[in-house]
Structure formats: C-alpha cells, structure tokens
Interface confidence: low
C-alpha cells in the first residue's frame, strides 16, 4: 500500500506563438482546479476502468481576474498535493490523465459553471520510494508543469511497496539473512516468503512460495521483460535477462494517443487503448453517447443512442458549443438600443437605459421636452432621438438634480473605482467583486446564488450542475 502524490507547479501559456486567451476575465472571474486519473500502464482493462489505480480532485485555486491588456500569466494554483492512495503493489509502469478545470464565478444570479480547460496524458515508469520526478506536458497552447512520486505507507517498503518492515527483535542487529529496512534503520525486513530466486526488483508475493511479476516483467522469477522485441532492433542493446538497457526513440514516445488514450508498442507500430467515449487509431474520434452525459451546463442531449450516431446538445440560454461548454456573451449582439448598457446576468439579459429611454431593450423613447422639467436652471434639449436636460454648471443627472461630481460620495463599494458618465456614474470593481456598485462579493464563503435549472426537465433528464 502507498500513496501517489502529484504537485502542480504551474499552468499557463506554453512557449511560442499563439498564446491562449486568459480563461478568466474582469466580467467573469474564475479559479482553477485539477483532477488526476491513474491506471496501471499495461492493463488491458484500462479502457473500461479509466482510473483503476485511483483518482483525486484538488481544492479550488484562488480567484483570478484578468488584468485588461496584460499577457496571460501562469494562473494561480490550488494549495497542496493531489494524493491518490493505492492498496496493492505499485505497478511500476502507469498511465496518467491530468485535467485542468475552470470554475467560472458568475454574479449574484449566474452562479459558478465548470468547464474543462486542458487535458494531458502520458505513460511513465516510476519506482516507489524514489525522488520527485519532474514533467512538462502541453495541451494545445497551454503548458502544465508538475512533479510526482509514489511512496509506500509503513510497514511496506521497496520499489513496489511489497516488502514489509518489522521492529527489531534485538536492539543491535537484524536476524540471520535479514537486512536493515532503509530508510527505517531501526527496523528489519520481514522474512522473505517468496519463491526462491524471485526478482526483488520486478517480483513480489502475497502468499508464501509465489512470485508475481510487476507490469512489464514475466517468467517464473520475473526476470524476463514482457517484450524484448524492440531491443532486437537498432534502438538499443538487448539482454535476455535484463531487457532493454538504453531504449532509443519508440513509436509511443510523446504519446500519439489523443484524449487520454494509453499507448502500447506493437512489433510494427503502436496501438492506442482509448478511454470510454473515444475510438480511432489515435483515439481522435468521439464515440460519446447521450448515456455518457456529454452536455454541460444543463444542456439537453438528443439522439446518439449508439457510438456511431451523433448526439446533439440543446443548450440552455446563455451557453453554446457542441457540448454547451461555452458561456455566450449575449451582450456582443448589442441587444440594447439607443445606447443602453447591456448586462448579461446569466439567466437573463438586462439593459440599463440612457436617460430618455425605457423598455426591456431601451426601445421606448420617453416623452419629449413637452412638460419636462429640468431642475436647477437646466434646459431640455432634443436631439438624435434623445431628450435630456442640459444642466447648468455644477449640476448633473437626468433632471439636473444631482451635484456635478457623482463620484464625490464614493458610491463604489469594496475599493471599486468610480468614473463619471453622461448618464450618472460607472463603477469599475476590484477583483473578486461585481454588481452595479461592486456590492456583491463574487465568492464570499457561499453567498453567490445559483442558476435556475432549464425549464421542462424531468428527473433523469441529462443535466449538469455548476
């Protein structure tokens, strides 16, 4: 038994051109979290049980808001390690999938929404008890830097966590033929009960007299590599007992399998074992069905009863994309007429109209200057469909009833910056706050509200939460 530990060092734009857009914005702050999935490297059941060795989910990272005009930096990460406990022997060869998820933090009505930012995968050989191994993986324009290790939980020790340690029976030395249990020098190895000659590096036993092999090794004493065929080529020297000593570049290097598929070498090329929902030579074809729940953010899945027929996600208002994974910026359609300010609240659009206009989309022109009173010596002006008061010096607002500097009263909460505007004032909120006056903390320990479910769904209908 033991624990696989993963430390994420950074997640940000990779080198080279085509830097990705920041996943967060001033209007939609967000935070990251990570998911790791482990499976034994040569396991044939990997496709059906994608996380046979275990999986773990990180905490959420700090809230991040993009600074307009600044390049996308490395994004703030969650604290701590991702830990995946394993009960049995550490397999030595394993496959991993690391997913980077974004939690968008909506406003008081919109609520959080999850979407997958990047997924990286690979296959590695790792001995338990060794030092941290560093790795860099790229997914599109993103780059993920991380370290990992496998460590045994006492009393297990060894590269596969299969040798056991016991406290010394005598204070000075271990029993005959038994070594001290590094690094626990005050303990001794338990008596060996495996078959005589069973490889201490590549074999282990759980019952007396047996010799079970770690992934990649075979033979009665686990001394023969599973495949030495690659060593008969010019790629590297071979040995009947030790296998490849210095493997050269192989067809699985760089993992040609997409979407988290694991690569296995074949005598001529390679073979991808695809996770559920994908198929094809490189796992590049999606075989997802509605039963897999592919529609995010409350999308309704239609069709796709079998992997060969396509499914369609019918997205709720405010979301788009083939899997409803993208939040629509409905304000980009400029639905507010006559210069109205558009607010996308997630569940609905709202227009904040300029003086002289009203209606859901500011489409109604209010009464003209007839009967309109402008206070404090202001005069009513008609022009371009807008009817407003031209105020005397020192006054402002729709009816000239406000003092000229609407920011003097410091109306923006939580450190928001106030800007005078022809229709009043505008608050530019500090990161983590929103609302017309920055009065709503984005995530004040559970104060943000959640979006309503789309209409017409029954229990059992495909739907996503957050």
């Amino acid at each position: 038994a033991g624990v696989f530990e993963l430390q994420i060092h950074s997640f940000g734009p990779g080198p080279g051109p085509g830097a990705p857009r920041s996943p967060c914005s001033a209007r939609l702050p967000c935070r990251l979290f990570f998911r790791v999935c482990l499976k034994p490297g040569l396991s044939e059941e990997a496709a059906e049980s994608p996380c046979a060795l275990g999986a773990a989910l990180s905490a959420r990272g700090p809230v991040y808001t993009e600074q307009p005009g600044a390049p996308a930096p490395d994004l703030p990460l969650p604290d701590g390690l991702l830990q995946v406990p394993f009960r049995d022997a550490w397999p030595g060869t394993f496959s991993f999938i690391i997913e980077t998820w974004r939690e968008e933090l909506g406003d008081q009505i919109g609520g959080p929404a999850w979407s997958l930012l990047a997924r990286v995968a690979g296959r590695r050989r790792l001995a338990a008890g060794g030092p941290w191994a560093r790795d860099i993986q790229r997914a599109g324009a993103w780059e993920l830097r991380f370290s990992y290790r496998a460590r045994c939980e006492p009393p297990a020790v060894g590269t596969a966590c299969t040798r056991l340690c016991r406290p010394r029976s005598a204070p000075s030395r271990c029993g005959p033929g038994l070594r001290p249990c590094a690094p626990l020098e005050d303990e001794c190895e338990a008596p060996l009960v495996c078959r005589a000659g069973c490889s201490p590096e590549h074999g282990f036993c759980e019952q007396p007299g047996e010799c079970r092999c770690l992934e990649g090794w075979t033979g009665p004493l686990c001394t023969v590599p599973v495949s030495t065929s690659s060593c008969l080529s010019p790629r590297g020297p071979s040995s009947a007992t030790t296998g490849c000593l210095v493997p050269g570049p192989g067809p699985c290097d760089g993992n040609p399998c997409a979407n988290g598929g694991s690569c296995s070498e074949t005598p001529r090329s390679f073979e991808c074992t695809c996770p559920r929902g994908f198929y094809g030579l490189r796992c590049e074809v999606s075989g997802v069905t509605c039963a897999d729940g592919p529609c995010f953010n409350g999308g309704l899945c239609v069709g796709g009863a079998d992997p060969d027929s396509a499914y369609i996600c019918h997205c709720p208002p405010g979301f788009q994309g083939s899997n409803c994974e993208k939040r629509v910026d409905r304000c980009s359609l400029q639905p507010c007429r006559n210069g109205g300010l558009c607010l996308d609240l997630g569940h609905a659009l709202r227009c904040r109209c300029r003086a002289g206009f009203a209606g859901p989309r500011c489409e109604h022109d209010l009464d003209d200057c007839a009967g309109r009173a402008c206070a404090n010596g202001g005069t009513c002006v008609e022009g371009g469909g807008a009817h407003r008061c031209s105020c005397a010096l020192g006054f402002g607002g729709r009816d000239c009833r406000e003092r000229a500097d609407p920011c003097a009263a410091r109306p923006c909460a939580h450190g928001g910056r106030c800007y005078a505007h022809f229709s009043g004032l505008v608050c530019a909120c500090a990161p983590g706050y929103m609302g017309a006056r920055c009065e709503f903390p984005v995530h004040p320990d559970g104060a943000s509200a959640l979006p309503a479910a789309p209409p017409g769904l029954r229990p059992g209908d495909p739907q996503r939460y957050l």
Epitope: A55, R60, G293, G446, Y465, L466
Partner: nanobody, 117 residues
C-alpha cells in the same frame, strides 16, 4: 450508479422549520457535488442550494440566511435546514448529485414541502 433518497418533507405553518435529508448510496458524498432543487406547481425548477466536493456552499438569493445546506460524511447524507418558511417555499424538493468519477448527474424522486396556515 448513485441512488438518492429524500426524506423530511411535510406540512408546516409559515415561519416554521423543516430539515430535508438526502441519503446517497454507492458513492461517498465527499466525492459528489450535491444540490437541492425545487419545483412549485406551474413553475420552473430552480436550484436552491449546493455543496461542492470542497465543502463550499452556494444559495439562491431568496433563501440565503434562512436555509442551510450541510453534509454528514459518516452518514453519507446531505441536509437542507429550512427556517422561517414562507408560502412561496411550497414545492417538491429534489436532491441532485453530480459524480466526478463518471461525470453524470443523478436525481432523487422528490419530497413535497407545503407551507400553509
């Protein structure tokens, strides 16, 4: 597959309190994001409160301060404590779970809460 069983609904007077329970089987509640939805007759279903895998909670604006969502890992259950109930809280309340291992949603069958004098 995750099974969700709700209980605790019933008839209560305005200003009264109720606690709804959602028991999850086949998966630990620590690995699930669980929420309570409600649907009043003739209205859309709306999300009332949610608790994520990290324990963070979110509430519908109109119930904030009156309702509290909590999780008991030992009993593998999630609760919705509802205080200061109003007539507009009358609805069928559904437990909903999102599981990370399969990324699939699951619903309970619902429990009726009626607030009337």
């Amino acid at each position: 597959e995750v099974q969700l069983v709700e209980s605790g609904g019933g008839l209560v007077q305005p200003g009264g309190s109720l606690t709804l329970s959602c028991a999850a089987s086949a998966s630990s509640v620590t690995l699930l994001s669980i929420a309570w939805y409600r649907q009043a007759p003739g209205k859309k279903r709306e999300l009332v409160a949610g608790i994520s895998t990290d324990g963070s909670t979110d509430y519908l604006h109109s119930v904030k301060g009156r309702f509290t969502i909590s999780r008991d890992n030992a009993k593998n259950s999630v609760y919705l404590q509802m205080n200061s109930l109003r007539a507009e809280d009358t609805a069928v309340y559904y437990c909903y779970a999102y599981t990370w291992t399969t990324r699939l949603p699951y619903w309970g069958q619902g429990t009726l809460v009626t607030v009337t004098s």
